[in-house]
């Protein structure tokens, strides 16, 4: 039967070292042995790539494409084949669809004055654009109370969040993780990072009295 | 060493044809986009062609579009420039020159780094 | 059609002296952050063309430190200090960034 796309591709730049392409198909296909995406950089000399996809789900295909580290000017053809038969055609700018790299090494360490700090590693190179354009998310929440969780937005530079322990409840287990995004480029959200759990052993100052 | 050999110059008739080739060494010819360029007596450079890597893309300046074509074959290290429909403003030396690295997504520039002796075509009656 | 001006034309200039040669193009050759896709060539008497500067002042291997490329997006300058006899020649600028590829109309450098 003729093969067919129900979602184009929807792609995304880590805007570092890798593009990620992912669609959808009319019905379950076995992504790497029946399609392949090509992309080529539209620049005076540049060759024709091919990236092999492979299933996410039974019909959603999606393929990782190593580029050059990314510039705002940077525009690539794809084409999407299913043997010599194109299946869809675009184009794709990097700079205008970034998707950050997820935050890493996320620890909590206990701190001064009853407060936790919260520190993890911007994912990019100081010699990369995108190092100093993240501001962050930081989700904290109870482990055994879904109505309790709080959300924090770090936008100043350091990826680094001082917490309060009396802003938690004595005794639960906490887990925060961590996503970010780069205004400036105007991302989406990056994927949250590994969650990292602690005891918060605060004990409420009417306790002592 | 880096060196670049073309040959196949001549005099040709208007309307004839001729093919120019290059020969390349002591460089990985396949990772390397080759140009052709072209000077007419007494006058300046003129870029003629470009090909990849791959040979995949061509690209041409429009004085000699449809009527040159630019190939390579790797295996051989060489590089072609087949012309037809020849007029006499197309009398001139043509060098072919390394141009960029197309192995990489995006061409590593570094210029017309190396050129070759050059090669004399006259068209004429 | 991107579109290389050159000026001067033709150059005199006595040995040991300052030579500056002036290229403009038609449109930005600017990609990106440092990198303008604007070489110089010199071709001297009876030779091939020589690669000099490219990417707007990065000097190809083996040019002396006497050849020095700059400007960026649509004004560029080739400056050669402490000029020498050999250093006579056409020297040409060209934009690397798009198809066709386009020189400027060279600039005749004479030693007195």
């Known amino acids: 039967g003729s093969v067919k796309v129900l979602h184009e591709p929807s792609c995304f730049s880590d805007y570092i070292s890798t593009s990620v392409c992912q669609w959808k198909m009319d019905h379950p296909t076995n992504c790497s042995a029946e399609l392949r995406l090509s992309y080529q950089l539209d620049f005076m000399g540049s060759e024709n790539h091919t990236c092999v996809p492979e299933n996410r789900e039974d019909s959603v295909c999606v393929c990782s494409m190593p580029i050059d580290d990314a510039v705002e000017a940077d525009v690539y053809q794809l084409d999407l084949w299913a043997g010599q038969q194109l299946l869809w055609s675009g184009s794709f700018q990097p700079s205008k669809h970034v998707k950050p790299r997820t935050p890493g090494n996320l620890t909590v360490h206990p701190n001064i004055s009853h407060t936790w700090l919260l520190m993890w590693t911007n994912p990019y190179p100081t010699e990369n654009h995108l190092h100093s354009e993240l501001t962050y998310m930081v989700n904290v929440s109870n482990d055994n109370d879904p109505e309790d969780f709080k959300v924090y937005n770090v936008t100043y530079m350091g990826p680094t969040l001082r917490l309060a322990a009396s802003t938690l409840k004595s005794g639960a287990s906490y887990s925060a993780r961590v996503r970010a995004w780069a205004q400036t480029y105007n991302s989406t959200w990056s994927d949250w990072s590994p969650s990292t759990t602690w005891l918060n052993y605060y004990e409420p100052w009417e306790q002592h009295l | 060493e880096v060196q670049l050999v073309e040959s196949g110059g001549d005099l040709v008739k208007p309307g004839g044809s001729l093919r120019l080739s290059c020969v390349a060494s002591g460089f990985t010819f396949r990772d390397y986009a080759m140009t052709w360029v072209r000077q007419a007596p007494g006058k300046g450079l003129q870029w003629v062609s470009l090909?990849?890597?791959?040979?995949?893309?061509?690209y041409y300046a429009d004085a000699v579009k449809g009527r040159f074509t630019i190939s390579r074959d790797n295996a051989k290290n060489t590089l072609y420039l087949q012309m037809n429909s020849l007029r006499a403003e197309d009398t001139a030396v043509y060098y072919c020159?390394?141009?960029?690295?197309?192995?990489?997504?995006?061409?590593?520039?570094?210029?017309?780094?190396?050129w070759g002796q050059g090669t004399l075509v006259t068209v004429s009656s | 059609d991107i579109v290389m001006t050159q000026t001067p034309l033709s150059l005199s200039v006595s040995p040991g002296e300052t030579a500056s040669i002036s290229c403009r193009s038609s449109?930005?050759?600017?990609?990106?952050?440092?990198?303008?896709?604007l070489d110089w060539y010199l071709q001297k008497p009876g030779q091939s063309p020589q690669g000099l500067i490219y990417?707007?002042?990065k000097r190809a291997s083996g040019v002396p430190d006497r050849f020095s490329g700059s400007g960026s997006g649509t004004d560029f300058t080739l400056r050669i200090s402490r000029v020498e006899a050999n250093d006579t020649g056409v020297y040409y600028c060209m934009q690397g960034l798009q198809s066709p590829l386009s020189f400027g109309q060279g600039t005749k450098l004479e030693i007195k």
């Open positions: 449109q930005s050759l600017l990609y990106s952050i440092g990198y303008n896709y």
């Open positions: 990417l707007g002042s």
């Open positions: 090909i990849n890597g791959s040979g995949g893309k061509t």
């Open positions: 020159a390394v141009d960029r690295k197309t192995k990489t997504i995006r061409p590593q520039y570094y210029g017309l780094w190396v």
